[in-house]
Interface confidence: medium
């Protein structure tokens, strides 16, 4: 629908509170280095302007697009050139090029200080003193660190954040109440950010068709009783929502997401029997609940897929009629029958099917040519099954920390050029697949594991894209979205890598390690492990294990010593010498 004033339309649809929150998120995701106060000022100016447009849609500038209005506002920031360098050149462009330019300058790894959690009493005082500012600051800090965070979902996180403080700041033991809730929000938030980052990468790097294929497969698994036309409609609407959010159109995205939730709930009888509880919740909870809803039961007595997609004499004719519709139907039919497969596996099967039809429908005897296409699926299905089985066995033997270390060694040998912090972050996350997925029964392991790995490997891809150092990473990240994991799995030790020069400073530790949390201490040790492998890529597992065991004993010993710093200095030198000897450095 055409509206005289887009800004007035969105303000009325979303309400003032959500409007202000979403504009703040949008601005913080674009200008990630700007101080909080500057953003609040910009948001208030935009909000006051929106109110004038609500009062009179014909008022001056009210007919401008949101990109024009927001871009003009961002370009008033005085320190743009000093703070952002070449991003300031975006302001010389016209829409839509200006917005595209801002999008290209979003930084997945901004140089921002780590968020340190203050004492609980300090947080509760700040919350009570000015609740609105406290919550805005939460939105701002998350948005600037996660420039692709799914904005309407961030509103849901903020609502839970507020609820946690409202409840816990009145509790007898504030810390016992609040800290687990904040930990849960932090972990869920990181996971949500990473999942959304994959959606945006899919749209931006591989196009709408790739995203739609992903959505057909996932929604067909989730809503196996829904008809193909219904799934297709949901896919179109979902694609619009995510295209908008990934493109910085956060007001439109939130508005359209609300409309989609409304549609799903109004039509739940023809979509899924699992939606009832979700649809009784308020808007933000409802949308979140729908996004996470469990798979509905598969309809009974679904006919064999082979009848329509292999045995039918009409396969090539139906394919020629509307290729993407026919492939969409194939994906829908396969996915609704296979909640036990990962989405990426389903997409590989659909790609294999498409390639076979492209080849066979131009052949002299098409049917004879594609008759065995389902046989080609067998190795594609078995590969992730076997990989998950092996890795879950390894995880069960080693536990999470040592499993992460095994992956650290494996991935450092594959792509040693990648920065150590990135290798540590990505391998730690890859290792979490064990505790996240191996506990599931066979039928749920693959969708859990392989789709989670897709999210984690996308983190590697976006971080590597910022500073490309490895052709192998670039190749695996860019050639095929659905084959990223098999591509990385297939990489062997990089024989072309010239080992890093040994630097004793890298392996010098201080007493501050003793006061770190267990997680931070693990990261320090894992950082050392990566550096070891970079120095000695041909080191055996046994050699590395011996050095890491010595290192753990060294840290434990010195942290118990009276003069910790002296212990670290003296024993550290001995450890470095022993490690060099053990590894032949």
């Amino acid at each position: 629908d055409a509206h005289k004033s887009e800004v007035a339309h969105r303000f009325k649809d979303l309400g003032e509170e959500n409007f202000k929150a979403l504009v703040l998120i949008a601005f913080a995701q674009y200008l990630q280095q700007c101080p909080f106060e500057d953003h609040v000022k910009l948001v208030n100016e935009v909000t006051e302007f929106a109110k004038t447009c609500v009062a009179d849609e014909s008022a001056e500038n009210c007919d401008k697009s949101l990109h024009t209005l927001f871009g003009d506002k961002l370009c008033t920031v005085a320190t743009l050139r000093e703070t952002y360098g070449e991003m300031a050149d975006c302001c010389a462009k016209q829409e839509p090029e200006r917005n595209e330019c801002f999008l290209q300058h979003k930084d997945d790894n901004p140089n921002l200080p780590r968020l340190v959690r203050p004492e609980v009493d300090v947080m509760c005082t700040a919350f009570h003193d000015n609740e609105e500012t406290f919550l805005k600051k939460y939105l701002y800090e998350i948005a600037r660190r996660h420039p692709y965070f799914y904005a309407p979902e961030l509103l849901f996180f903020a609502k839970r954040y507020k609820a946690a403080f409202t409840e816990c700041c009145q509790a007898a033991d504030k810390a016992a109440c609040l800290l687990p809730k904040l930990d849960e929000l932090r972990d869920e938030g990181k996971a949500s950010s990473a999942k959304q980052r994959l959606k945006c990468a899919s749209l931006q790097k591989f196009g709408e068709r790739a995203f739609k294929a992903w959505a057909v497969a996932r929604l067909s698994q989730r809503f196996p009783k829904a008809e193909f036309a219904e799934v297709s409609k949901l896919v179109t609407d979902l694609t619009k929502v995510h295209t908008e959010c990934c493109h910085g159109d956060l007001l439109e995205c939130a508005d359209d997401r609300a409309d989609l939730a409304k549609y799903i709930c109004e039509n739940q009888d023809s979509i899924s029997s699992k939606l009832k509880e979700c649809c009784e919740k308020p808007l933000l909870e409802k949308s979140h609940c729908i996004a996470e809803v469990e798979n509905d039961e598969m309809p009974a007595d679904l006919p064999s897929l082979a009848a329509d997609f292999v045995e039918s004499k009409d396969v090539c004719k139906n394919y020629a009629e509307a290729k993407d519709v026919f492939l969409g139907m194939f994906l829908y039919e396969y996915a609704r029958r296979h909640p036990d497969y990962s989405v990426v596996l389903l997409l590989r099967l659909a790609k294999t099917y498409e390639t076979t039809l492209e080849k066979c429908c131009a052949a002299a005897d098409p049917h004879e040519c594609y008759a065995k296409v389902f046989d080609e699926f067998k190795p594609l299905v078995e590969e992730p099954q076997n990989l998950i089985k092996q890795n879950c066995e390894l995880f069960e033997q080693l536990g999470e920390y040592k499993f992460q270390n095994a992956l650290l060694v494996r991935y450092t040998k594959k792509v040693p050029q990648v920065s150590t912090p990135t290798l540590v972050e990505v391998s730690r996350n890859l290792g979490k697949v064990g505790s996240k997925c191996c506990k599931h029964p066979e039928a749920k392991r693959m969708p859990c594991a392989e789709d989670y790995l897709s999210v984690v490997l996308n983190q590697l891809c976006v971080l590597h894209e910022k500073t490309p150092v490895s052709d192998r990473v670039t190749k695996c990240c860019t050639e095929s979205l659905v084959n990223r994991r098999p591509c990385f799995s297939a990489l062997e030790v990089d024989e072309t890598y010239v080992p890093k020069e040994f630097n004793a400073e890298t392996f010098t530790f201080h007493a501050d390690i003793c006061t770190l949390s267990e997680k931070e201490r693990q990261i320090k040790k894992q950082t050392a492990l990566v550096e070891l492998v970079k120095h000695k890529p041909k080191a055996t597992k046994e050699q590395l294990k011996a050095v890491m065991d010595d290192f753990a004993a060294f840290v434990e010993k010195c942290c118990k010593a009276d003069d910790k710093e002296t212990c670290f200095a003296e024993e550290g030198k001995k450890l470095v010498a022993a490690s060099q000897a053990a590894l032949g450095l």
Epitope: K233, D314, A320, E321, V325
Partner: antibody
Framework: EVQLVQSGAEVKKPGESLKISCKGS????????IGWVRQMPGEGLEWMGI????????RYSPSFEGQVTISADKSISTAYLQWSSLKASDTAMYYC????????????WGQGTLVTVSS | QSALTQPASVSGSPGQSITISCSGI?????????VSWYQQYPGKAPKLIIY???KRPSGVSNRFSGSKSGNTASLTISGLQADDEAEYSC???????????FGGGTQLTVL
């Protein structure tokens, strides 16, 4: 080079029968749908129906069902449109098009056949 | 009566941009971007200028662009030229086992 060549213009009387043709060349005739389109004088385009020469599967737009017959002979890569009893209202230009899917993507067109029905 | 609705005529001056709308796109056609646009000069066969909503066949000027919002597709011609004066028709997929449909056509006049 892909080409669709249609038969020449026809002048007929009401009640007469007629069969016009569309010969494809330069591509695999059996693997693409062929569509027929009517354009009455001064009017817009209308899809009449489609045929898949590979197995002669034929579909008609509701307003043309029973009014015309679409057929194909894959051995000579030719599609046909025929009337058993013409009416004055059948006066129009008729085009055939190769369809890249029935998604209305007619990427190659014949030059058109003008059919005039008048007593 | 066409299932797709287009304005009967639009006009613009050389150098300007014009947009022709085509409403009534089915949900399935929308989901899979199955909308095409044709240009037709008097006495000539139609020519495909846009397919799958936004794609241009090779040889078609980049002044022609397509888009879609909801159940409405649009054709935009930028930098109008005298030889753009023609009839423009949209066409869309009508569902499996069905025949596609055309819009009523829009006559573009370059002033």
């Amino acid at each position: 080079e892909v080409q669709l060549v249609q038969s020449g213009a026809e002048v007929k009387k009401p009640g007469e029968s007629l069969k016009i043709s569309c010969k494809g060349s330069g591509y695999s005739f059996t693997n693409y749908w062929i569509g027929w389109v009517r354009q009455m004088p001064g009017e817009g385009l209308e899809w009449m129906g489609i045929i898949y020469p590979g197995d002669s599967d034929t579909r008609y737009s509701p307003s043309f069902e029973g009014q015309v017959t679409i057929s194909a002979d894959k051995s000579i890569s030719t599609a046909y449109l025929q009337w058993s009893s013409l009416k004055a209202s059948d006066t129009a230009m008729y085009y055939c098009a190769r369809l890249h899917g029935v998604v209305s993507r007619g990427d190659y067109w014949g030059q058109g056949t003008l059919v005039t029905v008048s007593s | 009566q066409s299932a797709l609705t287009q304005p009967a005529s639009v006009s613009g001056s050389p150098g300007q941009s014009i947009t022709i709308s085509c409403s009534g796109i089915s949900s399935l056609a929308g989901s899979y971007n199955l909308v095409s646009w044709y240009q037709q000069y008097p006495g000539k066969a139609p020519k495909l200028i846009i397919y799958e909503v936004t794609k241009r066949p090779s040889g078609v000027s980049n002044r022609f662009s397509g888009s879609k919002s909801g159940n409405t597709a649009s054709l935009t011609i930028s930098g109008l030229q005298a030889d753009d004066e023609a009839e423009y028709s949209c066409s869309s997929y009508a569902g499996r086992n069905a025949v596609a449909v055309f819009g009523g056509g829009t006559q573009l006049t370059v002033l």
